[in-house]
């Protein structure tokens, strides 16, 4: 493979904590300029595995605000509008990194952590363990 | 109240570019100890949405792999495990922080980015637009 | 250059209701921020009202004097947030300032518009 | 709601005075407090935030401490422009987010 030459302007790397404390520029840049307009908003009404939204807030975290999403019922919506309960509504979760501020009281320093949050939800069919 | 000083450990905030550029501990901290054992890795099959997942790569990205879910259908599974093309299949997604390597290559210093990302889908009743 | 911009205020009798606008620009309404209003009577302090999130969830945190009376919304497209301000009294005239909480850290206002009077008087 | 209380209310001093302006919180905030600059017709100007952290700009005389309840705001070497009101708010969250203003220290000459 190619050798790409180390970048002169890069920060020194001679600090003994290198490489796991790094220099993170916050001018976030944000690729989702191009969002789909039919966006996931509504999704959590219309959905057969309906969910709300749930705010978890920390200001010693960034993003200080995550929402959570928490199944409005055991069941899915049928097509009758009632709750099916021989399906299942559950939550899709994924596994976030977010920053944390640490040591505290240091507002520009920060420890890297990872987080599972439940996104939405979706109707599967249930396991069924058939008793002998 | 006992004033707590600012710690002497704290990255130096007189650099012209902070509060924007910090410093971040990669010894990432895991929050996901009591992970749900049913965790939804076979959910993406046995939803009425399924997806499959794909890999995103990226080596100037951390994390450098992130898993999209693209749902199979356009319609949703029903009882009878046909597609009902009555219901949408539609993604559900989330706006995520990775870190970019910036300036390109040097391993130690990051910019902060958010990119939108599929987490899995879920079966929506579909807006039906009249024609007058 | 980053900046909000109130409008809407002037005489209202009590009673009345009244809106008021906050144009943010050389930013855009995202997840990466609130938007909040607080006012100052003549001569007095700084009191906040509420705060709305930018992003696409609607969630709105209010003081507990103004729950119920006032009420902020938000335009996303017109980068626009709103005051609604119903069966409003003497005692709410006041200078009512738009102001911004980045996402980065929610515990203080970082941007500040120029404020907008309103007086209710009969 | 929290409260928090702010001393002395005015104050006067002269040019190269040390000044200190106190901010007591009615439960604790841990340090999530910042310090506003206010001059007439004007909207507040954020000077610290998290206690202790000077925002951009803010001339180094300015300066934050406390954490908890007891909060500190000191200007080590008053200037004419520094002539002005100035407020502590508080951040908080239990089951909603709040913010609280002190009632304001006018700094006269």
């Known amino acids: 493979g190619i050798t790409i030459p180390r970048n002169p302007g890069c920060p020194n790397s001679e600090d003994k904590n290198f490489p796991r404390t790094v220099m993170v520029n916050l001018n976030i840049h944000n690729r989702n300029t191009n969002t789909n307009p039919k966006r996931s908003s509504d999704y959590y009404n219309r959905s057969t595995s309906p969910w709300n939204l749930h705010r978890n807030e920390d200001p010693e975290r960034y993003p200080s605000v995550i929402w959570e999403a928490k199944c409005r019922h055991l069941g899915c919506i049928n097509a009758d509008g009632n709750v099916d309960y021989h399906m299942n509504s559950v939550p899709i979760q994924q596994e976030i990194l977010v920053l944390r501020r640490e040591p505290p009281h240091c507002p520009n320093s920060f420890r890297l952590e990872k987080i599972l949050v439940s996104v939405g939800c979706t109707c599967v069919t249930p396991i069924v363990h058939h008793v002998a | 109240g006992i004033t707590i000083p600012r710690n002497p450990g704290c990255p130096n905030s007189e650099d012209k570019n902070f509060p924007r550029t910090v410093m971040v501990n990669l010894n990432i901290h895991n929050r996901n100890t009591n992970t749900n054992p049913k965790r939804s890795s076979d959910y993406y099959n046995r939803s009425t949405s399924p997806w499959n997942l794909h890999r995103n790569e990226d080596p100037e990205r951390y994390p450098s792999v992130i898993w999209e879910a693209k749902c199979r259908h356009l319609g949703c599974i029903n009882a009878d495990g046909n597609v009902d093309y009555h219901m949408n299949s539609v993604p559900i997604q989330q706006e995520i922080l990775v870190l970019r390597r910036e300036p390109p290559h040097c391993p130690n210093s990051f910019r902060l980015e958010k990119i939108l990302v599929s987490v899995g889908c879920t079966c929506v009743t579909p807006i039906v637009h009249h024609v007058a | 250059e980053v900046q909000l911009v109130e409008s809407g205020g002037g005489l209202v009798q009590p009673g009345g209701s009244l809106r008021l606008s906050c144009a943010a620009s050389?930013?855009?309404?995202?997840?990466?921020?609130?938007m909040c209003w607080v006012r100052q009577a003549p001569g007095k302090g700084l009191e906040w009202i509420g705060c709305?999130?930018?992003?696409?969830?609607?969630?709105?945190d209010y003081a507990s004097w103004a729950r119920g009376r006032f009420t902020i919304s938000r335009d996303n497209s017109k980068n626009t947030v709103y005051l609604q301000m119903n069966s409003l009294r003497a005692e709410d005239t006041a200078v009512y300032y738009c102001?911004?909480?980045?996402?980065?850290?929610?515990?203080?206002?970082?941007?500040w518009g120029q404020g907008t009077l309103v007086t209710v008087s009969s | 709601d929290i409260q928090m209380t702010q001393s002395p209310s005015s104050l006067s001093a002269s040019v190269g005075d040390r000044v200190t302006i106190t901010c007591q919180a009615s439960?604790?905030?841990?340090?999530?407090l910042a310090w506003y600059q206010q001059k007439p017709g004007k909207a507040p100007k954020l000077l610290i935030y998290?206690?202790?952290t000077l925002a951009s700009g803010v001339p180094s005389r300015f300066s934050g401490s406390g954490s908890g309840t007891d909060f500190t705001l000191t200007i080590s070497s008053l200037q004419p422009e520094d002539f002005a009101t100035y407020y502590c708010?508080?951040?908080?969250?239990?089951?909603?987010?709040?913010?609280?203003f002190g009632g304001g220290t006018k700094l006269t000459v």
């Open positions: 709305i999130y930018a992003g696409d969830v609607d969630d709105t």
């Open positions: 439960q604790t905030i841990n340090y999530w």
């Open positions: 050389g930013f855009s309404f995202s997840s990466d921020y609130w």
């Open positions: 708010q508080n951040y908080y969250y239990s089951t909603s987010r709040s913010y609280g």
């Open positions: 102001a911004r909480v980045d996402g980065f850290d929610i515990t203080y206002f970082d941007l």
């Open positions: 998290r206690a202790s």
